[in-house]
């Protein structure tokens, strides 16, 4: 029960993460207009990945993308890598998490495959959660860099004469919507990967007891069933191990339903 | 048809208070920022207040903040302007203004002024 | 505060011919998030309120003929009337729409030769 709860609560924290970073990517907040210690401006610049914004103090909001790929900044493409990346893999994570949660039965798919779909979506979830993380602080790395330059010079002289007034940005809301997503994302993967571990079926301890007749060399099983150690066919005499490795010819003994909560 | 009536106008001593309203009408007054501005006799104009359609923010020019206030009713389409401690330079036709949309930040409709004049 | 000033004062054209108004600003009107200048200038006439005609340095305001135009950027800026009639004899002002306060420039004045 712990472990579908685990599995579960998992898979939700990263599905609500990853719709954050999907939102994070799409939002144009990522940067916004130092309104402090400021001149007061008549309009409100704010830029996201994507394009850059102007809301003038009547209301009216004119946006306009960055149409192109090679005049752009270096890093910022780097940001937009990071943040698809992070989706993409994140995507993958929760249709493969979909596959593997306990509490879906998907025809006869065994335990230990669901415990390998859990890891692995477990894993791309950490991934996913760390490329949003990174993304959204190298930005706000950058963010930080440019502010305190732009601060260096607040005001550029034009000869003496006219000044130009730099306008300094902020860390605006996507990058918090970033932190976050990208936090909870990388917490589902985390409790994707625990969740796996109560998932993978340990080996049976259960000792199969051959009975060998005087003479003859079947194997004798009380109650009618064919000699047998195990719950299959072969009769062939196995060294008994108490969990550790497995013949090579020995047939896989599945735990059932009930061995697990 | 966009329609803006300045009132509340006249002869005031100095020290006094006058409340100037802005009647609107033929546009949604709700959705739109308003502007205060002044023109004394003969001379340029000078702006003098805006307040945001929501009643906030609101900006003054720095030698009127404290004396002037603006406020507005959406309700029954107002706007006003309370002026405290007036002196004989604030002698001048009160215009109010609409902030245009989509038109970078400019008046675009102005009513027709009312006239205050300052004098003992 | 934002320092607009405007020349000439005044302006005598003949009927027909090119006015000319400048109005410079002490800071740049250039917005950089999305490269345009917030000028605007407005027409007032005798006993008139103001009336705008050109908003962001250079596009007309509706109704508004196309013998004004407008142009310039940063800091520098110019009102054409490319051929002046009776009905523009008027004070014309520039305004800064990017920064409060907004402030006007003094105005020019023009009348006809």
């Known amino acids: 029960m712990a472990v579908t709860a685990c599995q579960g609560l998992g898979f939700v924290v990263s599905l609500i993460g990853i719709a954050g970073i999907i939102a994070a990517t799409c939002m144009d907040q990522w940067s916004t207009q130092d309104l402090y210690n400021n001149p007061v401006t008549a309009v409100f610049n704010y830029q996201g990945l994507w394009r850059s914004c102007v809301r003038e103090s009547s209301g009216f909001t004119e946006c306009r993308g960055y149409f192109t790929l090679l005049g752009l900044p270096a890093m910022l493409q780097a940001v937009r890598a990071l943040m698809i990346v992070g989706i993409v893999l994140g995507a993958i994570g929760l249709l493969v998490s979909i596959f593997a949660l306990k509490c879906i039965r998907i025809g006869s798919m065994e335990d230990s495959a669901k415990a390998n779909m859990t890891l692995t979506s477990g894993i791309m979830f950490i991934v996913s959660g760390l490329c949003a993380i990174a993304g959204v602080s190298v930005f706000a790395n950058m963010l930080v860099t440019n502010f305190w330059m732009s601060t260096a010079n607040m005001y550029t002289g034009m000869g003496g004469m006219v000044q130009t007034v730099q306008t300094r940005y902020t860390f605006g809301a996507a990058l918090f919507v970033g932190w976050v997503a990208g936090g909870l994302t990388l917490i589902g993967g985390v409790m994707m990967c625990i969740a796996c571990r109560g998932l993978a079926p340990e080996e049976t301890n259960y000792k199969a007891v051959s009975y060998h007749a005087s003479g003859h060399s079947v194997a004798y099983k009380p109650g009618g069933f064919k000699a047998s150690t195990g719950f299959g066919s072969n009769t062939k005499n196995k060294k008994i191990y108490d969990g550790g490795a497995r013949t090579e010819d020995e047939v896989q003994s599945y735990p059932s339903k009930h061995d697990y909560v | 048809e966009v329609q803006l009536v300045e009132s509340g106008g006249g002869l005031v001593q100095p020290g006094g208070s006058l409340r100037l309203s802005c009647a609107a009408s033929g546009f949604t007054f709700s959705s739109f920022g308003m502007h205060w501005v002044r023109q004394a006799p003969g001379k340029g104009l000078e702006w003098v207040a805006y307040i945001s359609s929501g009643s906030s923010p609101i900006y003054y020019v720095d030698k009127l903040k404290g004396r002037f206030t603006v406020s507005r009713d959406n309700a029954k389409n107002s706007l006003y302007l309370q002026m405290n401690s007036l002196r004989a330079e604030d002698t001048a036709v009160y215009y109010c203004?609409?902030?245009?949309?989509?038109?970078?930040?400019?008046?675009?409709?102005w009513g027709q002024g009312t006239l205050v004049t300052v004098s003992s | 505060d934002i320092v607009m000033t405007q020349s000439p004062d005044s302006l005598a054209v003949s009927l027909g011919e090119r006015a000319t108004i400048n109005c410079k600003s002490s800071q740049s009107l250039l917005n950089v998030g999305n490269q345009k200048n917030y000028l605007a200038w407005y027409q007032q006439k005798p006993g008139q309120p103001p009336k705008l005609l050109i908003y962001?340095?250079?596009t007309r305001e509706s109704g508004v003929p196309d013998r004004f135009s407008g142009s310039g950027s940063g800091t520098d800026f110019t009102l054409t009337i490319s051929s002046l009639q009776a009905e523009d004899v008027a004070v014309y002002f520039c305004q800064n729409d990017l920064f409060y306060p907004l402030t006007f420039g003094g105005g020019t004045k023009v009348e006809i030769k």
């Open positions: 962001g340095a250079s």
């Open positions: 203004a609409r902030a245009g949309y989509a038109v970078r930040n400019a008046l675009d409709y």
